[in-house]
């Protein structure tokens, strides 16, 4: 009984199309596949950033695969050929591994790359990124930001830099069409007359860095002798009501502080008839139904009632 063997895929490589971390892994069928003409060959691909403990594994019938990587580190990948049992009239067969690596040759020392990169997607409308220059770099150093997400033909450079002392320290992005719920890739590189500057790569999803506007139109309504309903409206902009969580801070008579987190634009507060003053503020954040993370808005303007009988009227700002 001859043992059936199959070769690994040929010409396995990682190709960088210039998308700042979104890479193509590609290969060719193994040699001597003639024996398995009636057979659908599959490939098991394992890949990771160097230093990561776990491999990502996929099985595909294709000769290519695409995924995002952290270009601050190297990438390693391996692939082998898989023959289902139908190909061999027995048990499944797998080839040895073909392996490849990819990394961007780093220029400059790590300290020269930008520090404290921070990106915020204001009100799910305006993306702004800011950074500090690298440690010990001279004033002639300038940084340039490039970005890409699926849907763009190629990486684009920032066209509206925020400057300080002639240096680029941030970027105001233009309107980013169909850019949420997908990986957003950024590279900040630099140039200096004196020394090479290390590039930095960042990846995030825009819906996870949203900072909404604060809620508006805060009002009070007496519901009963011991209940007051606090109400507010969602901030103006594209974020739907179903995407908000709210945090409320309530002060009664300058003493009691109540904080609560709610999903709706109302909160019912138990009070006594002796309450002389009531103030509250609200802030908003994108919730778990619309994102994996988010940034709290600023607090709303304070809305207060004082000195009048809450049971007599509805209180508006």
């Amino acid at each position: 009984d001859t043992e059936i063997k199959v070769n690994p895929p040929q010409d396995f490589e990682i190709v960088d199309p210039g998308y700042l971390g979104y890479l193509y892994l590609q290969w060719q069928p193994p040699l001597s596949l003639d024996h398995f003409k009636e057979c659908t060959v599959e490939y098991e691909l394992k890949y990771r950033n160097i230093g990561s403990e776990t491999w990502k594994t996929i099985i595909t019938k294709n000769l290519h695969y695409k995924d995002g990587f952290d270009l601050n580190k190297g990438i390693e990948a391996k692939i082998h050929t898989l023959l289902p049992w139908q190909c061999t009239n027995g048990s499944e067969v797998q080839s040895s591994w073909a392996e490849t690596t990819y990394w961007i040759s780093p220029q400059g020392i790590p300290e020269t790359k930008v520090q404290d990169m921070d990106c915020v997607y204001y009100n799910w409308q305006y993306l702004l990124c800011s950074w500090k220059p690298g440690i010990g770099v001279l004033l002639d150093t300038n940084y340039n930001l490039f970005y890409w997400y699926e849907g763009l033909d190629h990486a684009l450079q920032c066209v509206d830099y925020i400057k300080a002392d002639g240096q680029n320290i941030g970027c105001r992005f233009p309107y980013l069409e169909a850019s949420d719920y997908k990986d957003f890739y950024i590279c900040v590189n630099g140039s200096s007359e004196n020394k090479p500057i290390r590039s930095s790569y960042f990846t995030f999803q825009l819906q996870n860095i949203v900072k909404p506007l604060p809620p508006v139109y805060l009002t009070f309504t007496r519901e009963s002798s011991c209940e007051i309903k606090l109400k507010w409206s969602i901030p103006l902009g594209p974020i739907p009501a179903r995407c908000f969580d709210y945090e409320i801070e309530i002060r009664e008579d300058d003493t009691t502080l109540v904080t609560a987190t709610v999903e709706n634009e109302t909160y019912t507060l138990k009070t006594t008839n002796e309450t002389r003053q009531l103030c509250f503020v609200v802030r908003s954040k994108v919730n778990i139904y619309c994102s994996d993370d988010g940034i709290w808005s600023e607090w709303s303007d304070k809305q207060c009632w004082e000195g009048e009988d809450l049971s007599k009227k509805t209180l508006l700002r």
């Epitope: 659908t40 594994t57 019938k61 049992w85 139908q86 027995g90």
Partner: antibody, heavy 121, light 108 residues
Framework: EVQLLESGGGLVQPGGSLRLSCAAS????????MTWVRQAPGKGLEWVSA????????YYADSVKGRFTISRDNSKNTLYLQMNSLRAEDTAVYYC??????WGAGAFDYWGQGTLVTVSS | DIQMTQSPSTLSASVGDRVTITCRAS??????LAWYQQKPGKAPKLLIY???SLESGVPSRFSGSGSGTEFTLTISSLQPDDFATYYC??????????FGQGTKVEIK
């Protein structure tokens, strides 16, 4: 005639464990890949896990990775799913499924009748 | 992950109608697509594999077509036994294997 018969479902508390079994007959069990597919009440189909014919390779959905373990005993013609750290969202009918063609998955040509797993306190 | 999107979600039809259900993949899956029929309280049943191959024992009024990202399941003349929920499934690249959300074919 191909038959797949699941067992082991039932009511379990959140954080608890359960082991599903699937007794197979009517085909050479050691050859095809096998999978588990689940269906939450009133919802669609969700692939859970797959295992190759030899049992040498296993694959999992992200939602169960690290909590569920698929295995098979080819001498007993039986497929297993060990489910640990169960959550309310694992409540579903679990189907044992034979892969028609392919290494670890493909079109699913035979399905068991399903066993209901309910995770509730 | 490859997303599978079926349309419509619900389809009202009469016996004898020609019925078409569409399945769209978020990226090309060649012809690695299957269609299933599921009746309430029962396990799904394979109808079509490799986008257009009819599973043994399935009536010839069922047919599948398409490749790449667009696929259709057609029932040439709807029979009373065909009122059910239909699912598409890709097996081009996994894990995960992914299914469409289902299309319920109900009596008009």
């Amino acid at each position: 005639e191909v038959q797949l018969l699941e067992s082991g479902g039932g009511l379990v508390q959140p954080g608890g464990s359960l082991r599903l079994s699937c007794a197979a007959s009517g085909f050479t069990f050691r050859r095809p890949a096998m999978t588990w597919v689940r269906q939450a009440p009133g919802k669609g189909l969700e692939w859970v896990s797959a295992i190759t014919g030899s049992g040498g390779s296993t694959y999992y959905a992200d939602s169960v990775k690290g909590r569920f373990t698929i295995s098979r005993d080819n001498s007993k013609n039986t497929l297993y799913l060990q489910m640990n750290s169960l959550r309310a969202e694992d409540t579903a009918v679990y189907y044992c499924v034979k892969v028609r063609y392919g290494w670890g998955a493909g079109a699913f040509d035979y399905w068991g009748q399903g066993t209901l797993v309910t995770v509730s306190s | 992950d490859i997303q599978m999107t079926q349309s419509p979600s619900t389809l009202s039809a009469s016996v004898g109608d020609r019925v078409t259900i569409t399945c769209r993949a978020s990226q090309s899956i060649s012809s690695w697509l299957a269609w299933y029929q599921q009746k309430p309280g029962k396990a799904p049943k394979l109808l079509i594999y490799d986008a257009s191959s009819l599973e043994s024992g399935v009536p010839s009024r069922f047919s599948g077509s398409g490749s790449g990202t667009e696929f259709t399941l057609t029932i040439s003349s709807l029979q009373p036994d065909d009122f059910a929920t239909y699912y598409c499934q890709q097996y081009d690249t996994y894990p995960p294997i992914t299914f469409g959300q289902g299309t319920k074919v109900e009596i008009k």
